[in-house]
């Protein structure tokens, strides 16, 4: 096992005058030299002391010495003004040795018994220093048996002399455009035996300015220039200093972006040091003049390297670099004294020519062609056939550059076709019906594609029809030939439309009855609405009040007439609604399967027969007049009926449209 520390042999003992405890003889001289190990001292005290008293202890005495220093000369029994007796005092050697000398002269007036003393070695506490004496250690002193050691505060390192703390004050780099630096501990005395290096390193283009502030106190010499402690300032151009003494050095304008400050101290002295406040300057950039209708921020007396400004435009004006818009603009001053980008303009916001409104027009209110900030335009829809959807059509050019409605909308208003307009006032008949005149059924659509069928225009790009009429084309929508705006089935004069997609009700099952016999065709283009092409209205919630039993509806189409041929001219018939139970009963008997008539169907026709829709009319609309709105709406879709059209006791069966309003609205809004 490793050996522990080797403790010194104990040093202790007793001293006494010759013959003690008896009286001592005359003319005696006795000397003891006591030695303790290094780092220890000797402690001595008397348990008995009885010597002849004499002036300044000239006759008999005990003298204690440590090295060259006399610690005490003792005589008598008790101390007087000029003589000292040990009493209960304890005496300590200054180092590790103590000399004790006993002397008696040639005579004693009476017998004296001398002295007895005890001594022992004890550790010296080197960290305890007498007032006024230099401390053992610069910072922290640590005593231990037989010695001591020094340590330093954070930021310092112990010098090789093992007592002085040198400052760790090199390698500090200052990169801010201004700041302060000072000698370590300023304004307290700076540390000894230190070499400090401070660097100020700014971006190229800056010039450092040094100002010495508050006080300056660096050890100096009357004849030699700063031989002890000094401060030097070095730039890439020149060296300034050395500086010492008590006078604040003058401002130094370095004309450099890098500065090295060196501060060196020796082992002695007690001086407070120095403090530098540094700033920087650079070549100023031209003063930024705000463009018209703009302002500069921040406003400064001058702008130098790295300073920046932003331009903000007044409301209704926008930042532009030529034709290109900017959301924000900030310029930065460069080292050569120029701005890194040119000043933009604050141009009045121009919303540009407003977009064309399909089936409508736009009017400049503020002035012809005026499209700048706060300009007003008015959209309107083509009268009679179109109406504007929830919008007053007034738009203002706002600061964001968009035409904006009074409700804050930036999208165009919508011109919706007016629905349910008809030139017709009285009824007629189809199977046993009457010829339609122009404008009577402007929603009527002729669907060709395998068979002849019909449909009704909804809005300006949808057709409502029967599922069974377009079932075969559901996957080939483009095969449907859709014609409108004509009365004659074979006329070459019609408006052509093409299908983009066919949507058959998911509840419809082909060849298994006619429940949910409803479909929508989306047109690939909007059709232009006019007196001959106008959509039919969808029923309002209140529409059922116009579709009670015996209320009259009108069906139209080019289906089979009484002659057994497809009609050349569009035909129509006015027919009453039949009681639902009556109709259900009519189709309960063979050859019709039970449950043929469902709640999704309505029936119309005369019990006596003769007025009915027929093959070729499928998908066409059974329409009713809403007397409140004076608009025609679709109540039913021609779906199915008896084998022989217009048969007595049988009725035409129509898809009940009011049951499908949510389905229709969902399809139209989704697609």
């Amino acid at each position: 096992t490793p050996l522990g520390p080797k403790w010194p042999e104990p040093v202790f003992g007793r001293l006494a005058s010759p013959g003690f405890p008896g009286e001592y003889a005359n003319d005696q001289e006795r000397r003891w030299t006591l030695t303790a190990p290094p780092g220890y001292r000797l402690r001595l005290y008397f348990t008995h002391f009885d010597l002849e008293l004499s002036h300044l202890c000239e006759y008999d005495f005990v003298k204690l010495s440590s090295g060259a220093k006399v610690l005490a000369t003792l005589c008598g029994q008790e101390s007087t003004d000029t003589e000292r007796a040990p009493g209960k005092d304890t005496f300590y050697s200054l180092g590790s040795s103590l000399d004790i000398t006993f002397r008696s002269d040639y005579s004693n007036e009476k017998p004296f018994t001398g002295f007895e003393a005890f001594y022992a070695a004890e550790d010296i506490d080197e960290c305890q220093v007498a007032p006024g004496e230099a401390p053992t250690c610069d910072h922290h002193c640590h005593n231990h048996l037989g010695g001591f050691y020094c340590s330093c505060r954070a930021g310092y390192v112990l010098h090789r002399n093992k007592r002085t703390c040198s400052a760790l004050c090199s390698g500090q780099v200052f990169t801010q455009r201004s700041g302060e630096l000072s000698s370590p501990e300023y304004p307290r005395p700076y540390p000894k035996l230190s070499s400090c290096t401070y660097s100020i390193s700014l971006e190229e283009g800056f010039s450092v300015i040094l100002d010495f502030v508050e006080s300056f106190d660096v050890e100096t010499h009357p004849e030699t220039l700063c031989p002890y402690d000094f401060l030097k300032i070095q730039t890439d151009r020149e060296e300034h200093g050395p500086f010492c003494g008590k006078t604040l050095p003058h401002r130094i304008e370095t004309k450099s972006n890098t500065v090295t400050i060196t501060f060196v101290t020796d082992e002695s002295g007690d001086h407070t040091g120095w403090k530098i406040h540094y700033t920087s300057t650079a070549q100023p950039c031209p003063y930024p003049m705000a463009p018209p209708n703009g302002h500069v921020s921040p406003v400064q007396a001058k702008y130098i390297l790295k300073d920046s400004f932003s331009i903000f435009c007044e409301t209704g004006y926008e930042l532009l670099q030529g034709h290109l818009p900017l959301k924000s603009f900030t310029a930065v001053c460069q080292k050569d004294g120029s701005w890194d980008r040119p000043m933009p303009a604050c141009s009045i916001v121009d919303c540009g020519p407003p977009d064309d409104l399909p089936s409508g027009r736009v009017e400049y209110i503020t002035g012809p062609g005026v499209t700048t900030y706060k300009a007003v335009i008015q959209y309107s829809c083509e009268e009679t056939f179109y109406t504007m959807k929830v919008n007053d059509g007034k738009y203002v050019c706002e600061a964001d550059g968009f035409w904006t409605s009074s409700k804050g909308e930036k999208s165009l208003p919508v011109c919706e076709p007016v629905c349910g307009l008809s030139a017709r006032t009285t009824g007629g008949q189809i199977y046993g019906g009457q010829k339609a005149k122009p404008g009577d059924f402007p929603w009527q659509v002729l669907i060709l594609g395998g068979t002849t069928a019909a449909g009704a225009l909804l809005y300006d790009n949808w057709v409502l029809t029967a599922a069974h009429a377009v079932y075969e084309q559901k996957h080939d929508a483009s095969a449907l030939d859709i014609r409108m705006g004509t009365l004659k089935r074979l006329s070459p004069h019609y408006t052509q439309a093409w299908s983009e997609a066919v949507f058959i009700h998911e509840g419809y099952t082909h060849d298994a009855g006619f429940d949910n016999d409803i479909a929508l065709i989306k047109l690939n283009n909007k059709v232009v609405i006019n007196s001959n092409i106008t959509p039919i209205c969808l029923p309002r919630k209140e529409a059922e009040s116009f579709m009670r039993t015996d209320d009259i509806g009108t069906a139209s189409g080019w289906g089979l007439t009484q002659r057994g041929f497809l009609a050349r001219n569009l035909m129509y018939v006015d027919i009453p609604i039949v009681d639902h139970q009556k109709c259900t009963a009519a189709y309960e008997k063979p050859p019709y399967p039970r449950g043929s008539v469902t709640a999704n169907m309505l029936c119309a026709g005369l019990e006596s027969g003769g007025k009915d829709s027929c093959r070729g009319d499928s998908g066409g609309a059974l329409v009713f007049l809403d007397s409140e709105t004076e608009r025609w709406f679709v109540g039913g879709i021609v779906s199915w009926g008896s084998m022989n059209c217009g048969e007595a006791g049988q009725y035409g069966v129509y898809t009940k449209v009011i049951n499908y309003i949510p389905w229709i609205e969902n399809i139209i809004s989704d697609f």
């Epitope: 030529g322 290109l324 040119p342």
Partner: antibody, heavy 114, light 107 residues
Framework: QVQLQESGPGLVKPSETLSLTCTVS?????????WNWIRQPPGKKLEWMGY???????SYNPSLKSRITISRDTSKNQFSLKLSSVTAADTAVYYC???????WGQGTLVTVSS | EIVMTQSPATLSVSPGERATLSCKAS??????VAWYQQKPGQSPRALIY???YRYSGIPARFSGSGSGTEFTLTISSLQSEDFAVYFC?????????FGGGTKVEIK
């Protein structure tokens, strides 16, 4: 680092609509600037087609105004070009760029041919 | 529209020599002019904006000047990588327009 990348079909039939998308990384198209579409027919000079600004406003070259639409999808940080009724004269390398051209896409060749 | 006319169409220069490229606008465009370098099969590379402001990363040998209708791009000492086509571009007014380009080739 700001990067722009064009994408879309390299071949379009006459009379159809040319559609291209520019995906921007390293910068939000709503933060600032104008975002341009520029094209260069083979052996010819560059032609500015239009831009969409940080706010969503558009500006088009009048020579293309009836056929061009520039839109954006801010959630994907993309802006798009649609050019309708194309002809062989629309065959070009199409570039997207930022503002006055500090960043460009690598370009994509679109050929109009049946 | 504003027409940007570049001259010469081709400039033959030896490496190390100075090249001066001209661009004239058909009407006043202020300083709203940019210059680009384009090499075959590559997209244009921005050199100068606002007539005289060099983009960061562009070597100091490239400099731009001019305002109003006359603009110049100067390459003080041509390096081998500088041989390319150079375009000027005005962004002062709609439509933004480009010059036809100047091809700088090795003499």
């Amino acid at each position: 680092q700001v990067q722009l990348q064009e994408s879309g079909p390299g071949l379009v039939k006459p009379s159809e609509t040319l559609s291209l998308t520019c995906t921007v990384s390293g910068y939000s198209i709503t933060s600032d600037y104008a975002w341009n579409w520029i094209r260069q027919p083979p052996g010819k000079k560059l032609e500015w087609m239009g831009y969409i600004s940080y706010s969503g406003r558009t500006s088009y070259n009048p020579s293309l105004k009836s056929r061009i639409t520039i839109s954006r999808d801010t959630s994907k940080n993309q802006f798009s070009l649609k050019l309708s009724s194309v002809t062989a004269a629309d065959t070009a390398v199409y570039y997207c760029s930022r503002h006055y051209g500090d960043y460009w896409g690598q370009g994509t060749l679109v050929t109009v041919s049946s | 529209e504003i027409v940007m006319t570049q001259s010469p169409a081709t400039l033959s220069v030896s490496p190390g020599e100075r090249a001066t490229l001209s661009c004239k606008a058909s009407q006043n465009v202020g300083t709203n002019v940019a210059w680009y370098q384009q090499k075959p099969g590559q997209s244009p590379r921005a050199l100068i904006y606002s007539a005289s402001y060099r983009y960061s990363g562009i070597p100091a040998r490239f400099s731009g000047s001019g305002s109003g209708t006359e603009f110049t791009l100067t390459i003080s000492s041509l390096q081998s990588e500088d041989f390319a086509v150079y375009f000027c571009h005005q962004y002062n007014a709609n439509p933004l327009t480009f010059g036809g380009g100047t091809k700088v080739e090795i003499k």
